[in-house]
Interface confidence: low
């Protein structure tokens, strides 16, 4: 769990820099994945350990503010806060060394236990993938930064320019649950072991040779569509929500967050001066200014909030987990002060939740969201955020309850509908999920125009035989989520030749094809021997891609890595393949045997990337009943012959023979990828 040494990665990740902050960080990952707009940068700080706990100061009831507060009395807010601050998560405990009496914090650090640890990703990213990896997936205009909600110079003057202090809401297109994808970009998926389909198995990028510096001209444009099957996402501030409804826009414009209580209005000039420093990027000076204000006015919520923002900025500047944890704690302190304006309280806790998620403190973030919902029970958007918070820790049941509650109060909440539909589909309640996904997308509400929802709606419709599926894929394509109606892969490099079926000559890999076809019996016999003697090496498909039947795989290479154990079972096949780096080095693919038994139907599905082509060598093919459709053309396998298709296009498989079908799958890099791209694209 050695955490990221920023010195090691700074300067090496420049061309990943999608948001212009001079380095690769989580925001860039978000942009590259289409989960965030290009603009603000936030610190690339993977999870480390828990924030220190600060005892709250004594609470006193908050004075009423005339505008933009919840119906509940502020006294209630304060007492609730008081209770909840004391009941803070262990994440907030001040923990000692492992051998000491209390041990080290674990739960926010224990994500290392999975193959999806953030630290790995930031330690080993290669510098070559360009920030031009835009995606058709999601054109988002501009991220709301942590302070876009309240430009101090404007917001503190709750009068002068009536429009100047409104939160930047109406033009944002940041999708509700897709703000920071902390763990998303390059990981070895713990959940999906792809088969012929295949699901995504993303892994951290391996470091490039040191002697291969990358110029800006060596840019790879990788389009990353939004659908990752399993996605870890953050909840952006509510103020990031877009609204297209003119009436709603008008309402939004009227709402000016009130960030100053009576006392803070009396020290507004000092607050303004400190904030100006922050705005001008003089972070260290701003930190000192706000620290001094906090020292002078320890009960000032706005000074404390300014200090938190400065620490937040400083964490970004220094790429420091430690500083960011301090910011998270200071946002918490804001909430524990007396007489905090409700708007400031909400902003502070929302930012706290957001930064906790950024650090990977999903459960801590969930607690913050729970507090927000308790403090502002009438704010549906917070409940929606809470639902996502539950989803982020894998708690579908509680997420479902939250969305049921939202829908019982606001039955037309599109965001709640798509997420509720999403959960139903995850629970394999296919038919039930459709109306929620459909109506949710149709609502046009913020956070609903998300590729995953189109993907799952189309998929659900296909599974119940509803031809309308393609209408939704078409719409998803038009809205930039998919490359085409047929080609719905997620991790795409722009401009690669796109066709469902290929001939060996078109691929340029004729030697590999010849070798496979010449040696097909040897390959077959080793596969059959493994089936005979070590059947356990064939692992069943577990991605819910089958309508029915039995389908398993035995993998020799994945992500460009040879599986030594597996190759013991098929040594000659492995030796044969070693001569062909276009496949053994294809980090976005696999080499594997695939056995499918009679009575199997694989639903239409798409692979994760357009960066590979998939070769199928027929080994044991029943006379009839086995076929594969890719896009709108259906073919059959032949023993000893290779079929080549681009599995980023929708494909479907039927096995209605009377005996098993065995094929050998060999993924190769898309022939139009340059050697540079092949070296630097993150693995799948």
């Amino acid at each position: 769990f050695d955490l990221v040494d920023y010195e090691e990665v700074l300067g090496k990740l420049g061309i990943y820099d999608a948001d212009g902050d001079g380095d690769f960080d989580v925001d860039d990952a978000k942009v590259l994945l289409g989960l965030k707009e290009r603009s603000t940068s936030e610190p690339a700080v993977p999870p480390e350990e828990a924030e220190p706990h600060t005892e709250p100061e004594e609470q006193v009831p908050v004075e009423a503010e005339p505008q933009n507060i919840e119906d509940e009395a502020k006294e209630q807010i304060q007492s609730l806060l008081h209770e909840m601050v004391h009941a803070e998560h262990v994440e907030g405990e001040d923990l000692q060394q492992e051998d000491g009496p209390t041990g080290e914090p674990q739960q926010e650090d224990d994500e290392f236990l999975m193959a999806t640890d953030v630290d790995d990703r930031f330690e080993t990213l290669e510098p070559e993938v360009s920030h031009e990896e835009t995606e058709h997936s999601y054109h988002v205009e501009e991220t709301v930064s942590q302070d876009c909600n309240q430009d101090m110079e404007e917001m503190m003057s709750e009068q002068e320019n009536p429009d100047s202090s409104e939160p930047v809401v109406e033009d944002e297109r940041l999708h509700h649950d897709t703000d920071d994808v902390t763990y998303q970009v390059y990981e070895e998926q713990a959940v999906y072991e792809p088969l012929e389909n295949e699901g995504i198995e993303i892994t951290e990028v391996t470091a490039p040779p040191e002697d291969n510096p990358v110029e800006d001209s060596q840019v790879i444009v990788e389009e990353v569509s939004i659908f990752p099957v399993e996605e870890q996402q953050e909840v952006p501030p509510e103020t990031n929500r877009k609204t297209d409804d003119p009436e709603q826009k008008a309402k939004v414009k009227k709402k000016k967050p009130k960030l100053l209580n009576k006392f803070d209005k009396t020290i507004k000039a000092e607050l303004d001066a400190a904030e100006k420093l922050r705005k001008r990027g003089k972070i260290e000076e701003a930190v000192n200014a706000f620290k001094e204000l906090v020292r002078k006015y320890p009960q000032s919520p706005r000074a404390r909030y300014g200090k938190a923002q400065c620490e937040d900025d400083l964490a970004e500047k220094r790429r420091s987990n430690e500083v960011l944890r301090g910011a998270i704690e200071t946002y918490q302190e804001v909430a524990s002060l007396p007489d905090v304006p409700a708007d400031l309280l909400k902003l502070s806790l929302k930012r706290r939740s957001d930064r906790q998620q950024f650090l990977g403190h999903m459960r801590g973030s969930l607690l913050t969201l729970q507090r927000l919902v308790q403090l502002f029970p009438n704010d549906t958007s917070l409940k929606n955020d809470l639902g996502v918070g539950y989803l982020l820790i894998g708690d579908n049941d509680n997420a479902k309850k939250v969305y049921e509650e939202v829908l019982s109060v606001t039955p037309n909440d599109g965001f709640a509908k798509v997420h509720y539909g999403f959960i139903l589909k995850a629970q394999n309640k296919i038919a039930e999920s459709i109306p929620y996904l459909k109506e949710g997308i149709e609502s046009g509400d913020p956070g609903t125009d998300d590729g995953r929802f189109y993907f799952h709606l189309g998929d659900a419709m296909q599974r119940v035989g509803n031809k309308e599926a393609y209408k939704w894929y078409e719409l998803g394509h038009k809205r930039g989520h998919f490359a085409s109606v047929w080609q719905r892969s997620l991790y795409n490099v722009n401009g690669l030749k796109a066709q469902p079926w290929w001939t060996p000559k078109e691929t340029g890999y004729t030697e590999l094809v010849k070798s496979l076809e010449r040696n097909w019996k040897l390959i077959r016999d080793e596969g059959l021997a493994v089936m005979d003697k070590a059947k356990g090496l064939f692992l069943p498909e577990d991605e819910n891609l089958r309508e029915k039947g039995d389908w398993s795989q035995f993998t020799l290479w994945q992500q460009g890595r040879r599986n030594e154990n597996a190759c013991k079972g098929a040594p000659k096949t492995c030796t044969l393949l070693e001569k062909f780096p276009e496949t053994t080095g294809c980090r976005r693919g696999q080499i594997k045997y695939s056995i499918m038994h009679p009575g199997t139907h694989v639903w239409p599905h798409t692979g994760p990337t357009n960066c590979r082509l998939r070769m199928h060598l027929g080994l044991v093919i029943p006379k009839e009943g086995c076929k594969i459709r890719c896009a709108n053309e259906t073919k059959t396998w032949e023993e000893g012959k290779v079929l080549i298709f681009d599995d980023s296009f929708e494909h479907e498989v039927w096995q209605d023979a009377s005996s098993f079908r065995l094929i050998f799958i060999v993924d190769v890099w898309h022939p139009e990828l340059t050697p540079q791209q092949r070296r630097s694209l993150p693995a799948i």
């Epitope: 262990v90 674990q106 739960q107 999975m114 713990a190 870890q232 989803l391 982020l392 894998g394 577990d542």
Partner: antibody, heavy 127, light 106 residues
Framework: QVQLVESEGGVVQPGRPLRLSCAAS????????MHWVRQAPGKGLEWVAV????????RYAGSVKGRFTISRDNSKNTLYLQMNSLRPEDTGVYYC????????????????????WGQGTTVTVSS | IVLTQSPATLSLPPRERVTLSCGTS??????LAWYQQKPGRAPRVLTY???NKAAGTPARFSGSGSETDFTPAISSLEPEDFAVYYC????????AFSPGTKVDIK
């Protein structure tokens, strides 16, 4: 099916080393973190160590820190526990256990604690 | 973090409802799992994160509690439920198990 099988333990003298191994099958070993847990005769469970999916990081209980080393070979689907400077109090049944994982679409790292265990192997430290 | 369990042994007849108890010396939020172990066998996870049932855990098992006090329950004891039950926290390093409660037939 999903299986973890520990190697034979054995009787070893205090101060001597012993290496345990745990062979995994039926699942994608390289995607799972792994634990060792032990149980002294007639006593409760004691967590010993954990290693990340790729072997890059590990953690230990205070009682074994500096003496025991957890490691793995993903190409062989095998987990190891190298035990040095063994003491009588290290006697017990040693289990390897897998860290389970969720198939929730939103959450990648979330996991189900120790969801698959080996049958256990007995280590006796005695002169 | 120290985990305590009470009682050490519980003698109950079949079909009785049983409630166990586990306390932690610090707030572990909901990072608590329950394991069942039968003599001569490896433990098996029953619930994780307090109340989430692991695959294969019968419906009669339930978990509740948060922070420092946790109480799993078995609504109606079946013969196969007589075993030792451990709670385990994974909120802090090092991970730790409780001493265990033995549930035996009265």
């Amino acid at each position: 099916q999903v299986q973890l099988v520990e190697s034979e333990g054995g009787v070893v003298q205090p101060g001597r080393p012993l290496r345990l191994s745990c062979a995994a099958s039926g699942f994608a070993f390289s995607s799972h973190a792994m634990h060792w847990v032990r149980q002294a005769p007639g006593k409760g469970l004691e967590w010993v160590a954990v290693i990340s999916h790729d072997g890059s990081r590990d953690r230990y209980a205070g009682s074994v820190k500096g003496r025991f080393t957890i490691s793995r070979d993903n190409s062989k689907n095998t987990l190891y526990l190298q035990m040095n400077s063994l003491r009588p109090e290290d006697t017990g049944v040693y289990y390897c256990a897998r860290v389970g994982r969720s198939s929730n679409w939103f959450s990648r790292y979330y996991y189900y604690d120790m969801d698959v265990w080996g049958q256990g192997t007995t280590v006796t430290v005695s002169s | 973090i120290v985990l305590t369990q009470s009682p050490a042994t519980l003698s109950l007849p079949p079909r009785e409802r049983v409630t166990l108890s586990c306390g932690t010396s610090q707030n572990v939020s909901h990072h608590l799992a329950w394991y069942q172990q039968k003599p001569g066998r490896a433990p098996r996870v029953l619930t994780y994160d307090v109340a989430n049932k692991a695959a294969g855990t019968p419906a009669r098992f339930s978990g509740s509690g948060s922070e420092t006090d946790f109480t799993p329950a078995i609504s109606s004891l079946e013969p196969e439920d007589f075993a030792v039950y451990y709670c385990q926290q994974r909120s802090n390093w090092p991970q730790a198990f409780s001493p265990g409660t033995k549930v035996d037939i009265k």
